[in-house]
């Protein structure tokens, strides 16, 4: 609890708050308060927040912890940085995974799954940008492959298959009959 | 004027239990602290509780910390003490009072007093 | 906690006299330039009446006879010339900090 931090203090100011009979400086951020001050400009009685909870700021009326939140297994999601006292649980996804939100105007506290990233390898694409935030972006086919529809199709190994215009572009030849 | 009710006192076992009440009138009860102070047969004055007035937060004196309770229903302008574990030593007239806050200073002084109620503990 | 020491624990004087009555505290009260000790008044069968507040401001209602002065840690009331109705029982009371503590009394008796 300790003396008084300083003889004169400001009620209205943001290190002292009326808490209580008394104007208190409050508890520092991962510590909740267990009771107010007992004379004038005095220290609350601040105790650390338990295990599996946290407060993230500077408080004078908190006299309870928040709850740390637990990442959705459900939604693949993954703890990208432990709660501590004065953090909540980062929740992510694991690398290869990306960030799908819940609801079409997306902020950082919204709710979200993790899809899988799309391999651009085994399409048989570039990767054009890697797959972080948003979903993979692929790019044209990797050499030895043509468009064909949708996909990359493989250049044919011998001259016996049929080779369309695009193919003989990538791949080199015409078709043969 | 201002006035200060008290009702509840009266004979009680020791580990029993009692519930002093204190109706204020005659100013605006949310807006002020408020104690209860209790005196001893024959002894000086000792204080025993104080409530906030607008958070309601408590405080008490180690001697009855853990046993008595100090509450306010400002819908009703009353003051209550809830005395639990109750011992010999407790014996006394208690009395409610309004506690006044001066200046800046968040300083107070018990400017309004009831008449006082007895609370005798039996061993 | 701050122990209040008041002295003397009876003092004999008659209606007409000065009475002084003293008040030690275990630390200072003062804070912010006040001191935060008040004197109360009390008689046979009645509850306390504030008199004296922050060390020297007299409650209003109160008779202009009684004053109050110190700073820190020693304070003094004062009844300039004593009346019948002043013989009682006087406390003071420091606010610094809680728990709020009581001195133990000045019996003030008709000599």
């Known amino acids: 609890q300790g003396g008084t931090r300083s003889p004169r203090c400001d009620c209205a100011g943001d290190f002292h708050k009326k808490i209580g009979l008394f104007c208190c400086r409050g508890c520092p951020a991962g510590h909740y308060l267990k009771a107010p001050c007992t004379e004038p400009c005095g220290n609350s009685t601040c105790l650390v927040c338990p295990q599996d909870t946290f407060l993230a700021w500077e408080n004078h009326h908190n006299s309870e912890c928040a709850r740390c939140q637990a990442c959705d297994e459900q939604a693949s999601q993954v703890a990208l940085e432990n709660c501590s006292a004065v953090a909540d649980t980062r929740c992510g996804c694991k690398p290869g995974w990306f960030v799908e939100c819940q609801v079409s105007q997306c902020v950082s506290s919204s709710p979200f799954y993790c899809q899988p990233c799309l391999d651009c390898g085994a399409l048989h694409r570039h990767t054009r940008l890697l797959c972080s935030r948003r979903d993979t972006d692929c790019g044209t086919c990797l050499p030895g492959f043509y468009e064909h529809g949708d996909g990359c199709v493989s250049c044919p190994t011998s001259t016996l298959g049929s080779c369309p215009e695009r193919c003989a572009a990538v791949c080199g030849w015409r078709q043969m009959f | 004027q201002v006035q200060l009710q008290q009702s509840g006192g009266g004979l009680v076992q020791a580990g029993g239990s009692l519930r002093l009440s204190c109706a204020a009138s005659g100013f605006t009860f949310t807006s002020y602290a408020m104690s209860w102070v209790r005196q001893a047969p024959g002894k000086g004055l000792e204080w025993v509780a104080t409530?906030?007035?607008?958070?309601?937060?408590?405080y008490f004196p180690d001697s009855v910390k853990d046993r008595f309770i100090i509450s306010r229903d400002n819908a009703k302008n009353s003051l209550f003490l809830q005395m639990n574990s109750l011992r010999a030593e407790d014996t006394a007239v208690y009395y409610c009072?309004?506690?006044?806050?001066?200046?800046?200073?968040?300083?107070?002084?018990?400017?309004?007093w009831g008449r006082g109620t007895l609370v005798t503990v039996s061993s | 906690e701050i122990v209040l020491t008041q002295s003397p624990a009876t003092l004999s004087l008659s209606p007409g006299e000065r009475a002084t009555l003293s008040c030690r505290a275990s630390?200072?009260?003062?804070?912010?330039?006040?001191?935060?000790m008040q004197w109360y008044q009390q008689k046979p069968g009645q509850a306390p009446r504030l008199l004296i507040y922050a060390a020297s401001n007299v409650e209003s209602g109160i008779p202009a006879r009684f004053s109050g002065s110190g700073s820190g840690t020693d304070f003094t009331l004062t009844i300039s010339s004593l009346e019948p109705e002043d013989f009682a029982v006087y406390y003071c009371?420091?606010?610094?900090?809680?728990?709020?503590?009581f001195g133990q009394g000045t019996k003030l008796e008709i000599k």
């Open positions: 630390e200072s009260v003062e804070f912010s330039g006040t001191s935060l």
């Open positions: 009072a309004r506690d006044r806050i001066y200046g800046s200073v968040q300083y107070y002084a018990m400017d309004y």
């Open positions: 409530i906030s007035d607008g958070d309601s937060y408590s």
């Open positions: 009371q420091q606010s610094r900090k809680l728990p709020y503590t």
